[in-house]
């Protein structure tokens, strides 16, 4: 503890000139002060004064006002420094004394006389209330305040609480009278070191080094770090923890761009086709009658569905068709005929059938040949059998589809994995995605097909933490970590949902 | 019993950048009550305050190398660095690491046994 | 930049009082504290907060701080407190530290 007691010496009155033994002053009493503080006793006695002591310079003759003086000698109110917690009580002794000497330093000079003396025991607490008090003898009167206040810096009852105020990265305090520490705005904790981060930043994903800031944790983002950051390069995907990359509907792979959902997404098909998804970016249009193409882009002939039957000749109109018919033949299509059995009407070794009494027929054709009259060779590419864009072609009596690259099947219909081919070396792993295949290479191999052998592997120095897988290829950075569940980070280093408390990394 | 321990390269070029690493073993540098901080000692001479670094990263750096001085922590390793750059002969002394107390006051409690750095070429 | 001043040396007699002071602007309204380095050593915190002993230091040092000066005396001085000592404050964000007093014990 550390503080001080205050003496104000107001006046002094001494008319007779007189000194403590009867006698009187010559010319008058030149009159200076001795003041002992000490521990409290009952009775006072003699003995060091434990508390400290100290004189004045000659402060007046015989009876005299003493003004307040703040320097040099004859400083007014009497300062008496104590190093101690004060204990709330005191004895105090002020003395009287006459000097023929040096006014100055009368307490050096020979021949000092006591004129007289007053001593105070009791308690006084801490403050800054002068208590004024005035002490008469038969010859004498003293009137003086006193009071104890804390040094510079202390505070309490006692003056034993240690407070400065700062502003440094130690603490952001005042002092408070009792000595306990007031935060400036936007500080907290005990010391006052902890800043208040931007009110709603998140607990374990953001912090502050100054005031109203919210700095992310690797892996968050926003405002208030309450958003994750998803894995590098997910393209449909969101996260609910950082580097996750979870598919938005209707996409997938590694990075969610792979589109599961091709036709409602780009609406390929057009002219009214029915579109159906068949794998990542991969569909097929069913087209509408009259009209033909990948897209069902292309308008066909009206003709083209072959509609004059019979060996009739057809020719596009505006709107329709109109078919000529050979003879022999009539209506609409061509469809009644005026021949019977007996006119040898089915051509390519066709079996002719009556019908309805003889009044027209029936071919039957032998295989490869088609047609009311078997006057048609079979084209088994007529009904547009090869799906994706394959092309049909007639083999005798059958037909295959030529399929386009990235298909298979006997109607092109089956979408072939970009990765069937194996195309990663060294045990890399294949991802379909849509500019071709992307290898994720194991550790020491890098390349596009992991064919380049790492002579620095990044994941040989053991970078991912909390037993998580280490890619290399994947990213900039040379290798990407797999975090096992519960664990987040670029390196997996940060536990999931811990307590506020847990000390997070910058 | 929290220990300091620094590393790096005992001599160094001038114009270079000077790099320590500061290890601490028995306790976290993630603790919320401790900064930690970097003095040096030229041969013969007294201790000059560098700089010091909270684990979340703030950084405060004595105004007459602030220019050249760059101090970064890593937690998952409970490690601490510095980096002095465009070194010169002046630059040579012994160089601590320390843990500075917020309870103490930012008293220095613990401090490493010190590596001296020299730089010449 | 804020400076703190200490005399360069101080010598005592075995048993004697050595006091060593330092001197900075307005000092007293800073927490001072005071370090002790034996040659080939590292220093050691023998008072923070002006006037407080960290555990393991002997009572003979005590501190004070006020007005523009912070002082350090080691009572019943010993053989073994021979050694360099440094003052050390805070100036707002940046550490300062004195330069240094050289402890003789006589004799």
């Known amino acids: 503890g550390s503080g001080i007691f205050q003496l104000r010496l107001q006046e002094f009155v001494n008319q007779r000139g007189m000194l403590a033994n009867g006698q009187s002053c010559e010319p008058g009493c030149r009159t200076f002060f001795r003041i002992c503080l000490k521990h409290f006793q009952a009775t006072f006695s003699e003995g060091p004064c434990t508390f400290g002591n100290v004189s004045t310079p000659v402060l007046g003759t015989n009876s005299f006002v003493v003004r307040d003086k703040n320097s040099g000698s004859g400083r007014n109110p009497l300062q008496l420094p104590f190093n101690f917690t004060w204990p709330g009580t005191f004895s105090l002794n002020i003395q009287a004394w006459h000097t023929p000497g040096d006014d100055l330093r009368p307490e050096t000079s020979p021949g000092n006389s006591l004129i007289s003396q007053i001593i105070i025991q009791g308690s006084l607490a801490v403050g800054k209330i002068w208590r004024t008090d005035e002490q008469n003898d038969t010859l004498t009167r003293l009137s003086y305040s006193y009071r104890v206040i804390c040094s510079d810096n202390y505070y309490g009852e006692s003056c034993s609480r240690l407070c400065k105020k700062r502003d440094d990265h130690f603490g952001h305090y005042e002092c408070q009278p009792d000595g306990s520490l007031s935060c400036l705005p936007g500080w907290t904790g005990k010391y006052c070191d902890q800043p208040i981060c931007l009110s709603g930043c998140h607990e374990q994903n953001g912090y502050c080094s100054k005031p109203d800031e919210c700095i992310c944790r690797p892996g968050w983002q926003g405002r208030l770090c309450n958003e994750c950051i998803p894995h590098n390069g997910c393209r449909h995907g969101t996260c609910s923890i950082p580097w996750q990359c979870a598919c938005d509907e209707g996409w997938g792979g590694l990075f969610c761009d792979q589109d599961l959902n091709y036709c409602t997404h780009h609406s390929p098909c057009k002219n009214g086709s029915t579109c159906s998804n068949s794998g990542p970016k991969g569909y097929t249009c069913t087209c509408l009658p009259g009209y033909t193409g990948e897209h069902c882009e292309l308008g066909l002939s009206k003709c083209a569905s072959n509609p004059c039957r019979n060996g009739g000749s057809c020719k596009d109109q505006e709107n329709s068709y109109h078919c000529l018919c050979p003879p022999g033949y009539y209506g609409q299509h061509c469809e009644h005929s005026t021949l019977t059995c007996a006119d040898s009407p089915c051509f390519n070794g066709g079996s002719c059938r009556e019908r309805n009494q003889g009044s027209s027929y029936a071919c039957e054709c032998p295989p490869n040949f088609t047609g009311s009259n078997c006057e048609k060779k079979v084209d088994r590419c007529t009904s547009n059998p090869c799906a994706n864009g394959g092309q049909c072609q007639n083999r005798g009596p059958s037909r295959t589809c030529r399929c386009r690259p990235g298909f298979t099947g006997t109607h092109c219909e089956l979408h072939i994995s970009d990765c069937a081919r194996s195309p990663c070396a060294h045990g890399g792993t294949c991802h379909d995605l849509e500019n071709g295949p992307v290898c994720t290479c194991p550790a020491g191999f890098s390349g596009r097909r992991c064919e380049v052998r790492i002579t620095h592997d990044a994941c040989a120095s053991g970078p991912c933490f909390n037993g998580a897988t280490c890619y290399t290829g994947l990213s900039p950075n040379n290798f990407v970590c797999n975090c096992p569940y519960g664990f987040v980070g670029s390196r997996c280093e940060f536990p999931v949902g811990l307590p506020p408390s847990f000390p997070w990394v910058a | 019993e929290v220990q300091l321990q620094e590393s790096g390269p005992g001599l160094v070029k001038p114009s270079e950048t000077l790099s320590l690493t500061c290890t601490v073993s028995?306790?976290?540098?993630?603790?919320?009550?401790?900064?930690w901080g970097w003095i040096r000692q030229p041969p013969g001479k007294g201790l000059e305050w560098i700089g010091d670094i909270y684990y979340t990263g703030s950084t405060y750096y004595n105004p007459s190398l602030k220019s050249r001085v760059t101090i970064s922590v890593d937690t998952s390793k409970n490690q601490f660095s510095l980096k002095l750059s465009s070194v010169t002969a002046a630059d040579t002394a012994v160089y601590y690491c320390a843990r500075e107390d917020v309870i103490l006051r930012g008293g220095s409690d613990y401090w490493g046994q010190g590596t001296l750095v020299t730089v010449s070429s | 930049s804020y400076e703190l001043t200490q005399p360069p040396s101080v010598s005592v007699s075995p048993g004697q009082t050595a006091s060593i002071t330092c001197s900075g602007q307005?000092?007293?309204?800073?927490?001072a504290s005071w370090y002790q380095q034996k040659p080939g050593q590292s220093p050691v915190l023998v008072i923070y907060?002006?006037?407080k002993r960290p555990s393991g230091i002997p009572e003979r040092f005590s501190g004070s701080n006020s007005g523009d000066t912070a002082t350090l005396t080691i009572s019943g001085t010993q053989p073994m407190d021979e050694a360099d000592y440094y003052c050390?404050?805070?100036?707002?964000?940046?550490?300062?530290f004195g330069y240094g007093t050289r402890v003789t014990v006589l004799g």
């Open positions: 907060e002006d006037s």
């Open positions: 028995g306790g976290s540098i993630s603790s919320s009550s401790y900064y």
């Open positions: 307005r000092l007293g309204d800073k927490y």
């Open positions: 050390q404050a805070w100036d707002r964000d940046t550490g300062v």
